[in-house]
Amino acid sequence: EEELQVIQPDKSVSVAAGESAILHCTVTSLIPVGPIQWFRGAGPARELIYNQKEGHFPRVTTVSESTKRENMDFSISISNITPADAGTYYCVKFRKGSPDTEFKSGAGTELSVRAKPSAPVVSGPAARATPQHTVSFTCESHGFSPRDITLKWFKNGNELSDFQTNVDPVGESVSYSIHSTAKVVLTREDVHSQVICEVAHVTLQGDPLRGTANLSETIRVPPTLEVTQQPVRAENQVNVTCQVRKFYPQRLQLTWLENGNVSRTETASTVTENKDGTYNWMSWLLVNVSAHRDDVKLTCQVEHDGQPAVSKSHDLKVSAHPKEQGSNTAAENTGSNERN
């Protein structure tokens, strides 16, 4: 006469996180009398998942009516699966006694949980960098399972190749994290550029997740300065302009110096934006040459985004102009509208 067998037909079952997992188990006999119990793992540290005889297991329901006479199906459904539920589940027949004794175990069913990766988070360097410099971007995504995952980097749709990726932990785990660092060389045209980290995983059904970083938060394009002199109708006045071109971000302070002495300081306000996202600004100084006996050295000094000042000077010749006593240097400024 054949002894009771515990049959777990599925060697493995894969379930998406949040769904229910059905673990199948049938027995071939009602003998001996005693409960079926389900465990996760084997050995002394195994975790009780369900006991037909007693206990409260809110996430577990029996697939067939376990109290039904002649029931030999002890399959269970575990609701709201999370990656922490992964493992091998054993259906075990116990023999009634004091205490109940283990009679026979099924071969086990390995439950793997498919968990979606979190939305990739891309972060750039703490400080801005200038064109021609190489900056690092990191991309992180967490909580996915199984471990296999693909990560790609793009800059404005072009795939990048200079990056390093790690998936942790290296060994078995209920869920995994990915960390990648990409190196990007900045150019002057990168104000409107985007760096994209793209993560593909079996749980995403071919629709990868993306994280983006705008290079506008990373790049600093230093301005170019040009100081020019334009005559005005009044023969004793000269208009000197300082063209500040192609800078980013907008934070900029300009100071005029006359022979090294501060004449006026102003902050860029009415700027014009170039197609590449950089800005232009123009400041002018109206110089009353009759107030000067000697040549004047005019300096346009620009402090951009907290960086050390850059300057451009212009020598103003005054020897040819008649001197008018009592005149002061006058200065007026309005925003310019030069676009490149």
């Epitope: 009602l30 003998i31 005693g34 409960p35 005889k53 006479r69 029931n71 009634k96």
Partner: antibody, heavy 115, light 111 residues
Amino acid sequence: RQLVESGGGLVQPGGSLRLSCAASGFSLSSHGISWVRQAPGKGLEYIGTIGTGVITYYASWAKGRFTGSKTSSTAYLQMTSLRAEDTAVYYCARGSAWNDPFDYWGQGTLVTVSS
Amino acid sequence: DIVMTQSPSSLSASVGDRVTITCQASQSVYGNNDLAWYQQKPGQAPKLLIYLASTLATGVPSRFSGSGSGTDFTLTISSLQPEDFATYYCLGGGDDEADNTFGQGTKVEIK
């Protein structure tokens, strides 16, 4: 689905008797067969259960004198050293108790122990 | 061994009456629910009514119900029918697989 007992009758004190319980409509392979007796005018008394080879058990008072066995179609109860107080109707029933209750019963066979 | 005490030992009732029979175990039954109820009519084999304390056996009318856990159990017949006059037995199981004991029976007679 039914169980049919046979083998009862008159036996002298100290004698032996073997009862049979034939199943029809189902196999005994995956079911226990339990034996219950009822003395005249008295209540029911559990004797024991025959499962598979190693899974056979008896009430404490029945150990030693009562032995069960079964094939896929017939269960047996061997009774020895019979006494007058063993006089009863003997029933076989399908089941082992708890979640496997005694759901099918034979019609019973009367065993009379008398000299 | 577990001892099952049924009460009352007999009762008289009329058709349509609600009848309650109790069964008390000397210790908690196995799994707190190893308790079955059987009906026996004269000259017949017992018939399973309820098992696992409250599960109605196949083909048994719904007027029969079982309740209880641990040591105290009840069989209720909500509206007694003429065919229900019989003797009722509880069968309790202790922790040992051979420890199965019937109560002494409750005879339900016509008033």
